[in-house]
C-alpha cells in the first residue's frame, strides 16, 4: 500500500543565466528511500542520489548541475532550453516508486522571480 505523497516546488520560474533549486519531499510513509532519480522532460537522467553511493551527476550536466540541498538539485547557468518538466523519482521499499513533477520556466525578463512554494501535484 503506497501511503506516501510527494511534495514539489511545483511550477517555478527563473532568470536566464541564473540558477534554480528543484526540490521534492516524500512524506506520510515510513518506507526506506534507497535512491532518488532526477530526470529531464526528455527522460534523460540529470542526477542520482543513492543512499549508499551518494550523488552521481551525469556527464552531460556536470558543469551546470550541483547536488542538493538535501535530495534536491540546483540547476545553474540557465538557458531558455532548460524550460520544461523535471521529475524526481523516489525508489523506496516496500512502497516502490514515487514520482514528483516540477515545471520550470526560464524567462528572459529580469522580472522573473523564483517562487519556492511547495505543492502536491
Amino acid at each position: 500500500m503506497m501511503t506516501g505523497t510527494i511534495e514539489t516546488t511545483g511550477n517555478i520560474s527563473a532568470k536566464k543565466g541564473g540558477s534554480v533549486i528543484l526540490q521534492c519531499h516524500l512524506s506520510s510513509t515510513m518506507a526506506q528511500v534507497t535512491q532518488v532519480n532526477w530526470e529531464q522532460h526528455d527522460h534523460s537522467l540529470l542526477a542520482i542520489r543513492n543512499a549508499e553511493l551518494g550523488w552521481h551527476i551525469y556527464p552531460a550536466f556536470k558543469d551546470r548541475v550541483a547536488p542538493g540541498p538535501g535530495l534536491g538539485l540546483t540547476l545553474q547557468s540557465l538557458t531558455m532550453n532548460d524550460t520544461g518538466e523535471y521529475f524526481c523519482t523516489y525508489h523506496t521499499y516496500p512502497d516502490g516508486t514515487y514520482r514528483g513533477r516540477i515545471f520550470l520556466e526560464v524567462l528572459e525578463s529580469s522580472v522573473a522571480e523564483h517562487s519556492a512554494r511547495f505543492q502536491i501535484p
Epitope: T34, N37, E52, L53, G96
Partner: antibody, heavy 119, light 107 residues
C-alpha cells in the same frame, strides 16, 4: 562485458538448506544493486530478493521472507543467496541479475543454476 | 500485489511479420514496464525498460508502447533469432511481478 555466473544449485530434501553464489565480472560490482529471480518448472519468473549496492538494504517477497537471505561480498565481486527451510515450491532455476535503479529494470542476467527440492 | 497478465501464451508467425505481444497489469503501473527475452537455451536479456526505451544493443525492430494498465511489445520485422519467450515485468512496486510469458514460434 558484463558477466554473471551462478553456481551452487543442487538436489535437496524438503526442510534442507542451500547456498547459491553468483560471480560478477565486467563492471564495478560495488556500484550496483543485485537481485535473484527464479523460474519455476512451469516457466514462470518470480522475483526472489534484491540487495542494495553496499548491502545495507535487502528486500524479499513474502513467499521467501524469513527463509532466504541475500548477501554480497563486494571485495570478491560475489552475490549469495542462502536458502533454508526449503519447500518443493522452491524448485526452480535461479538467476542472478543486476538491478539498475536508473532503469527500473534488471539489465543483465546470468545463465541460472538449478535447485530441486524433493524427498 | 500487482498481477501481470500475458493473455497469449504462444504465438506463431512468419519471418518478416509484424508481431505484437500484449501485457496487462491489475493496477496502474505508471509506465514502469519492462520486457525481457528468454532464448530457448535459457539466456535472458532486457529488451525494453520504462515501456518504450530500448536497452543498449537491442535491434530497432523492437519497440514498446502503452500506459496505465495496458502495454505491448512489437517486433516490426520478425527474424529467426527472435524466436524466444517474451516476459513483461512491472518495476513500480515490490514484489516485482512478471507476466506468464508469450512463446513466439515460426510458422
Amino acid at each position: 562485458e558484463v558477466q554473471l555466473v551462478e553456481s551452487g544449485g543442487a538436489l535437496v530434501k524438503p526442510g534442507g538448506s542451500l547456498k547459491l553464489s553468483c560471480a560478477a565480472s565486467g563492471f564495478t560490482f560495488s556500484n550496483y544493486a543485485m537481485s535473484w529471480v527464479r523460474q519455476t518448472p512451469e516457466k514462470r519468473l518470480e522475483w526472489v530478493a534484491t540487495i542494495s549496492s553496499g548491502g545495507s538494504y535487502t528486500y524479499y517477497p513474502d513467499s521467501v521472507k524469513g527463509r532466504f537471505t541475500i548477501s554480497r561480498d563486494n571485495a570478491k565481486n560475489t552475490l549469495y543467496l542462502q536458502m533454508s527451510s526449503l519447500r518443493s515450491e522452491d524448485t526452480a532455476l535461479y538467476y542472478c541479475a543486476r538491478w539498475l535503479l536508473s532503469l527500473y529494470a534488471m539489465d543483465y542476467w546470468g545463465q541460472g543454476t538449478s535447485v530441486t527440492v524433493s524427498s | 500485489d500487482f498481477q501481470m497478465t500475458q493473455t497469449t501464451s504462444s504465438l506463431s508467425a512468419s519471418l518478416g511479420d509484424r508481431v505484437t505481444i500484449s501485457c496487462r497489469s491489475s493496477q496502474d503501473i505508471s509506465n514502469y514496464l519492462n520486457w525481457y527475452q528468454q532464448k530457448p537455451d535459457g539466456t535472458v536479456k532486457l529488451l525494453i525498460y520504462r515501456t518504450s526505451r530500448l536497452h543498449s544493443g537491442v535491434p530497432s525492430r523492437f519497440s514498446g508502447s502503452g500506459s496505465g494498465t495496458d502495454y505491448s511489445l512489437t517486433i516490426s520485422n520478425l527474424e529467426r533469432e527472435d524466436i524466444a519467450t517474451y516476459f513483461c515485468q512491472q518495476g513500480k512496486t515490490p514484489p516485482y511481478t512478471f507476466g506468464g510469458g508469450t512463446k513466439l514460434e515460426i510458422k
